[in-house]
């Protein structure tokens, strides 16, 4: 056959989908891959083609649309089972053509069981919800395409393995769940099970997403700097180890950027010549506030070093801030036989 | 399309009860929440509670708690508000309707008018 | 006396424009989504506007919608006689139960 242009697997779109549910993959060469959509193409008099590697196997198969109920069918550029088996597994191929234009990508899908309370393999997506701010809704995700907008679904949400169904501060509102206000205690997969009729069949579809209860907006602060501090001075004699920890605290921000960094003299320590070392620490609260330390740190200290101005900077979306270090040489303390002997005038 | 048939005027006497029925039709009973809402002539809306008819969890108005009692029949598509103890100034239109908590109530009865007289 | 407030009354003639404001507070209104409800004359209510700003289909754009910080604004242009009618808002609170608040309801005259 002629050259095709065969854009590989895309290994970027992980599909999974759970066994005996419907699925609608739609082809990636439109989403990803090409400049023009299918009904574009479709009107050039291209064709597009469906086939697909088992799991396990090197053989390319033609996809069985003849499969009784139409279990597999194609509707545009999209590939439908209804519902999806286990042994659906492989890697799917969509080719689009004519006799002088080819274009190809294959993709993984990977069909996966649950048990009873919604556990599997699948990958979950995280939905960050601000504690105690308000109304915040989540959505069933991905059911747009499944049924037309005269089909009126049931839905049912559970968190965990249980029915949401009381008037708490979770409430299941059709493909909304509404968090009347978050708490900790509402983290945790919530799932919604959305089951519609077609052709005198009931479908289900399961959506589950993990929800994490975060900082509020409300709350956030600038970073605010822990150590150092004008209460500890770093008091060290020439060829000591000086040891300062920068500790910052940063509100939580969505998609804020949080950065800690030393200056030695207004320098970056690059860009000095002494031999420092700057190791980071990081840890986060349950609402994922942020501490980052920063511990700068010279092996031997020398009495230049304990001159320069050692400052701890941070900075977030809420704004930036400065402190500097405490550091002293410190005054050797008097030998007795000499300073001490002359003090009191001994001979 | 979306009904809602309230049951018919009631006259009681102060101390009795009253159990006002609505008739839900034109959509997917269980999938919808029932709110319960009442109007003294003259005066405006005031919430009394709300019923989930898929599991049949309540929750009611603080001044109405202890009094008031909604429940529903899914064999039926039909819910219930009961109301005891009665006092002249529980005399009011009652609304069944139809909705969800964040995101307003959509449909409403037609009302049924409660006179409580001795 | 209702947790939201609202003018007891508002006029206007055909064709203006007219406001209603709803008061209330960072526990209902301002940390919460408002409805806005239309009843005429010996009717039940009918709902004009929910999520603060969302009109339900069949609900011509003349009525509109805002919310800001603790209070929450119906608008409606192009005044008609049909207009005539109480309107209320609503929210609810949650603090540790549920509540369900409406507002006391302005009558609105076109004059």
């Known amino acids: 056959s002629e050259r095709c242009d065969d854009w590989g697997l895309d290994t970027m779109r992980q599909i999974q989908v759970f066994e005996d549910e419907p699925a609608r993959i739609k082809c990636p060469l439109f989403e990803h891959f090409l400049k023009f959509n299918y009904s574009t193409a479709h009107s050039a008099g291209l064709t597009l083609i469906w086939y697909w590697t088992r799991q396990d196997r090197d053989l390319e198969e033609p996809i069985n649309f003849r499969l009784p109920e139409n279990r597999i069918s194609k509707e545009k550029d999209v590939l439908w089972f209804r519902p999806t088996l286990l042994n659906d597994t492989g890697n799917y191929t969509c080719m689009l053509r004519n006799t002088t234009y080819c274009s190809k990508v294959a993709f993984p899908l990977e069909v996966v069981q649950k048990d009873s309370c919604f556990n599997s393999p699948m990958k979950l997506p995280v939905h960050k919800l601000y504690i105690e701010y308000g109304i915040q809704r989540i959505t069933c995700p991905n059911v747009d395409g499944y049924f037309p907008s005269s089909v009126k679904p049931t839905i049912t949400w559970y968190m965990g393995c249980y029915k949401i169904q009381n008037f708490n501060n979770v409430i299941p509102e059709g493909m909304n769940l509404s968090f009347l206000i978050a708490f900790i205690s509402n983290n945790g997969n919530y799932t919604c099970v959305v089951t519609y009729p077609e052709n005198g069949r009931t479908f289900h579809l399961t959506r589950t997403l993990t929800v994490k209860v975060v900082g509020s907006p409300k709350n956030a602060v600038p970073p605010v700097i822990h150590s150092p501090n004008d209460h500890v001075v770093y008091e060290k004699e020439p060829g000591e180890e000086l040891l300062i920890p920068c500790t910052v605290y940063f509100s939580f921000l969505m998609d804020s950027r949080n950065e800690v960094w030393w200056t030695i003299d207004g320098k970056k320590p690059d860009d000095i010549p002494i031999d420092v070392t700057i190791n980071e620490s990081i840890s986060h609260s349950r609402t994922e506030d942020e501490t980052r330390t920063q511990i700068l740190s010279i092996k031997k200290v020398t009495s230049e070093d304990l001159k320069r101005s050692y400052v701890c900077h941070a900075r977030s979306a809420k704004g930036e801030v400065a402190k500097a270090a405490t550091v002293k040489q410190k005054v050797p303390a008097p030998r007795y036989t000499v300073e001490l002997a002359c003090g009191f005038g001994a001979t | 399309q979306v009904q809602l048939v309230q049951s018919g005027a009631e006259v009681k006497k102060p101390g009795a009860s009253v159990k006002v029925s609505c008739k839900a039709s034109g959509y997917t009973f269980t999938s919808y929440y029932m709110h319960w809402v009442r109007q003294a002539p003259g005066q405006g809306l005031e919430w009394m509670g709300i019923?989930?008819?898929?599991?049949?969890?309540?929750s009611y108005a603080q001044k109405f708690q202890g009094r008031v009692t909604m429940t529903r029949d899914t064999s039926t598509s039909t819910v219930y508000m009961e109301l005891s103890s009665l006092r002249s100034e529980d005399t009011a239109v009652y609304y069944c309707?139809?909705?969800?908590?964040?995101?307003?109530?959509?449909?409403w009865g037609q009302g049924t008018l409660v006179t409580v007289s001795s | 006396q209702s947790v939201l407030t609202q003018p007891p009354s508002v006029s206007a003639a055909p064709g203006q424009k007219v406001t209603i404001s709803c008061s209330g507070s960072?526990?209902?209104?301002?940390?919460?989504?408002v409805s806005w409800y239309q009843q005429l004359p010996g009717t039940a209510p009918k709902l004009l506007i929910y999520d603060n700003n969302k009109r339900p289909s069949g609900i011509p754009d003349r009525f509109s919608g805002s919310k800001s910080g603790t209070s929450a604004t119906l608008g409606i242009t192009g005044l008609q006689t049909e207009d005539e009618a109480d309107y209320y808002c609503q929210t609810w609170t949650y603090t540790g139960r549920l509540w369900i608040v409406f507002g006391g309801g302005t009558k609105l005259t076109v004059l």
């Open positions: 960072s526990s209902n209104i301002g940390n919460n989504y």
């Open positions: 309707a139809r909705g969800f908590v964040t995101s307003g109530i959509d449909y």
């Open positions: 019923i989930n008819p898929s599991g049949g969890s309540t």
